[in-house]
Interface confidence: medium
């Protein structure tokens, strides 16, 4: 806050802005009468130098003229490009209490001279829209920059605007508020930028177009589409666009793709027919648009329109799979799977499925529909059946999927040989098997079939199944496949009439079980030791169990145990053994075995046998 | 197809040390039960010892407890039985077995066991 020039003034040769590089004089004089009071020449002239209001340096040591008690010209050189603030100040040496007083400043600009503007792109957004000019002003010159851009062309048509860059604001754009017409089509027109500052001026070469190279018309609006008679593969797509389009450009995408069709449209006049789109699926659509077949510039893409196209009847076959259960002598129990459609096949929202189940000699039919993806009914054990399912939309159903219903474990000879699932990773399981070796009748399929072993999980769940070509012998199952889980996996091979199935366990991960089983009771029979127990609680037996093991040693001894190893039955819960001495205590547990090791010990339990040694 | 072959027998003197070998192919799965046996002539066979490939329990027989040491090495896929303190009663064909199926399992008995190697005769002499 420099109080207005009282004391003094300060001057800069040559001049208060000077190129980078230059090196300036500054002088500061006391007005006459002015200095300190007593002693004239205990007056002391010293110049601050300041940037961005930070005291940087005092210039004491600059000085190049001294008038003592009057006037001191200082020199300063390098100074860095922008504005730099110089104050002088009066010091008066013979009183060492008071602060130096400000005389007067000044602020010198170091900058350069503007090069001259390249890259100038002038647009005409529309054809009612004004013509604006950007370009590239070169280096950053560190001064107040004027820009004038001037335009010449038919007619004697002379426009010009201006504009100003500083440390605050940027000029590299100019509308020229004009509006160059469609009768100009063929016409040339110029402009040029010219840049002036205080170290100099530059003028941009001349830039020459036609109203064809810089008007982009508007982007086309009012989208929207009409299927013809509720089609959902062909639409007409309709826009509104400006008068002098000539050429279109169309995209558009389902909403969950990541690629464009794109189609190119001549003379459209707002109107182009869509043939290939897929039925029931929410598709997004935009519109660009040209003036001129090979000259100007595309529009910007319009709005979306998004929209979803209508049904049509699904044209899918269905994944049908089914278990069979006798529930008495003369009655059994079908339970019908079948898969959702994907939404290619499906082509709308299904409604329902249409289920047959037949006997085929008596012609016996039960029918139903169902919402739901599952069906079960009662029927004689007696008769050849045959099922089949049709899923249905609004727009129709899809043609019925046959299955003969089979004993699908019944024919030992179509059983497939050497089952193994091995655990791929996290989420899947590798099952490969051999052919049956001596089937009767030609292997038309085979099904891999899998169910988590839990309790409940044949009732509460439907099982998963995959269809195996019959030339394949592996199959990498991963739907609901979980870490730490045990999955019964059966392979069934079927020919066209008969089913032969062999059955593995297996999981993708596998952990030591979390415990070892509960033994609930001991009991003596005929000699034997009849050791009973239940199962390790689903969750905590992470994986497969292969193995159940029975330990025992006598009371109080520090000998290491027996043990007895014993597959793992899920329908088995209990073991005799039979190695026990009589009238000796001993002390029983039991743990399980994953492929990962062995659990904990369950619960202790002690036993003494009083039978006779065996 | 598993496949056990036996090495290391010999003659000793009472009170001698020899260390017998099984190496093991075609066992594919982490933990398997493997054990030595031996079949003094004119006896039964009898378990001296055995170890779970998975964890690496042992058990042994109550005549050799203390003298013999069973362990493995599963990178080279061998079973050892390290004899100390050998008596002129330990003389024997000794037998390495696998269990490769499953079934009931007790800890010595030779019918625990389904794959069987040739046999390696072990003379002590006093």
């Known amino acids: 806050n420099i109080d207005v020039c009282k004391l003094g003034t300060v001057t800069v040769q040559p001049a208060p802005v000077i190129p980078l590089g230059s090196a300036a004089n500054i002088s500061c004089s006391l007005n006459p009468k002015q200095g300190c009071s007593h002693y004239p020449s205990s007056n002391e002239l010293i110049l601050l130098k300041f940037v961005n209001d930070v005291l940087v340096e005092n210039l004491h040591g600059k000085k190049v003229h001294d008038h003592t008690g009057h006037s001191s010209t200082f020199q300063v050189t390098n100074l860095s490009l922008g504005m730099t603030l110089f104050v002088c100040k009066l010091n008066c040496s013979n009183s060492q209490k008071k602060p130096p007083v400000p005389v007067c400043g000044v602020e010198i600009s170091v900058g350069v001279a503007p090069e001259p503007p390249q890259n100038i792109s002038c647009v005409q957004e529309g054809e009612n829209g004004t013509v604006a000019c950007s370009w590239n002003s070169g280096k950053v010159t560190y001064l107040k920059t004027n820009y004038t851009l001037q335009l010449s062309g038919p007619n004697n048509l002379t426009c010009q605007k201006q504009c100003f860059s500083d440390n605050r604001q940027n000029c590299n754009r100019l509308d020229l508020g004009i509006n160059l017409s469609p009768d100009l089509a063929e016409s040339r027109f110029i402009v040029r930028v010219t840049a002036i500052n205080d170290l100099g001026n530059s003028s941009s070469l001349p830039h020459t177009f036609t109203f064809l190279d810089i008007v982009i018309p508007l982007p086309p609006w009012d989208i929207r589409i009409n299927f013809l008679n509720a089609s959902g593969s062909r639409g007409t797509l309709q826009w509104e666009d400006e008068g002098q389009v000539v050429l279109n450009q169309l995209r558009y995408q389902p909403l969950n793709s990541t690629s464009w069709n794109m189609v190119n449209a001549t003379n459209a006049k707002g109107k182009y027919d869509l043939r290939d789109l897929r039925p029931f699926t929410e598709y997004e659509f935009q519109i660009s648009s040209k003036l001129h077949l090979s000259g100007g510039s595309w529009s910007n893409w319009s709005e979306s329109l998004r929209t979803r196209t209508p049904e049509e009847e699904p044209v899918g076959i269905l994944d049908i799979w089914y278990m069979k259960q006798d529930i008495d002598y003369d009655r059994q129990q079908i339970s019908l799977f079948w898969k959702s459609l994907n939404p290619s096949e499906a082509r709308g929202k299904i409604l329902h499925y249409q289920v047959t189940l037949q006997e085929v000699t008596k012609k016996t039919t039960l029918q139903n529909t169902t919402r739901h993806t599952s069906w079960t009914r009662v029927i004689p054990r007696t008769g050849a059946w045959t099922a089949s399912v049709s899923a249905a939309n609004s727009k129709g159903a899809s043609a019925p999927t046959h299955i003969n219903i089979v004993d699908l474990c019944g024919t030992g000879l179509l059983a497939p040989h050497q089952v193994s699932a091995k655990s791929e990773n996290m989420d899947n399981i590798l099952v490969t098997w051999q052919p049956p070796k001596k089937a009767d009748s030609a292997v038309r399929e085979y099904i891999v079939e899998w169910r988590a072993l839990q309790p409940g999980s044949i009732t509460k769940f439907p099982p998963h199944w995959l269809r195996i070509p019959p030339d394949n012998m592996s199959a990498l199952i991963s739907e609901n496949i979980k870490p730490y889980i045990c999955y019964e996996i059966r392979v069934h091979a079927l020919s066209e009439s008969q089913g032969g199935c062999s059955s593995i366990r297996g999981d993708s991960k596998h952990k030591a079980p979390v415990s070892g089983p509960h033994i609930t009771a001991i009991t003596e029979k005929k000699e034997r030791l009849f050791i009973s127990w239940t199962h390790i609680p689903f969750p905590e037996q992470r994986g497969c169990i292969l193995h159940y093991r029975i330990y025992w040693k006598e009371r109080d001894s520090t000998a290491q145990p027996e043990l007895c190893e014993i597959q793992y039955r899920r329908s088995q819960n209990s073991h005799p053994i039979s190695s026990l001495q009589p009238r000796v205590t001993y002390v029983l547990w039991m743990t399980a075995v994953t492929a990962a090791g062995e659990s904990p010990q369950g619960n202790e339990r002690e036993f003494c046998p009083q039978g006779k040694a065996n | 197809q598993v496949q056990l072959q036996e090495s290391g027998g010999g003659s000793v003197q009472a009170g001698g040390s020899l260390r017998l070998s099984c190496a093991a192919s075609?066992?594919?799965?982490?933990?398997?039960?493997m054990g030595w046996f031996r079949q003094a002539p004119g006896k039964e066979r009898e378990g001296v010892a055995t170890?779970?490939?998975?964890?690496?329990?042992?058990y042994y027989a109550d005549s050799v407890k203390g003298r013999f040491t069973i362990s493995q090495d599963n990178a080279k896929n061998t079973v050892y039985l390290q004899m100390n303190s050998l008596k002129p009663e330990d003389t024997a064909m000794y037998y390495c077995?696998?269990?490769?199926?499953?079934?009931?399992?007790?800890?010595?008995?030779?019918?625990?066991?389904?794959?069987w190697g040739q046999g390696t005769q072990v003379t002590v002499s006093s």
């Open positions: 077995a696998a269990r490769t199926v499953g079934g009931t399992f007790y800890t010595l008995a030779a019918d625990s066991f389904n794959t």
């Open positions: 075609g066992i594919t799965y982490r933990g398997v039960w």
């Open positions: 170890i779970y490939t998975g964890s690496g329990h042992t």
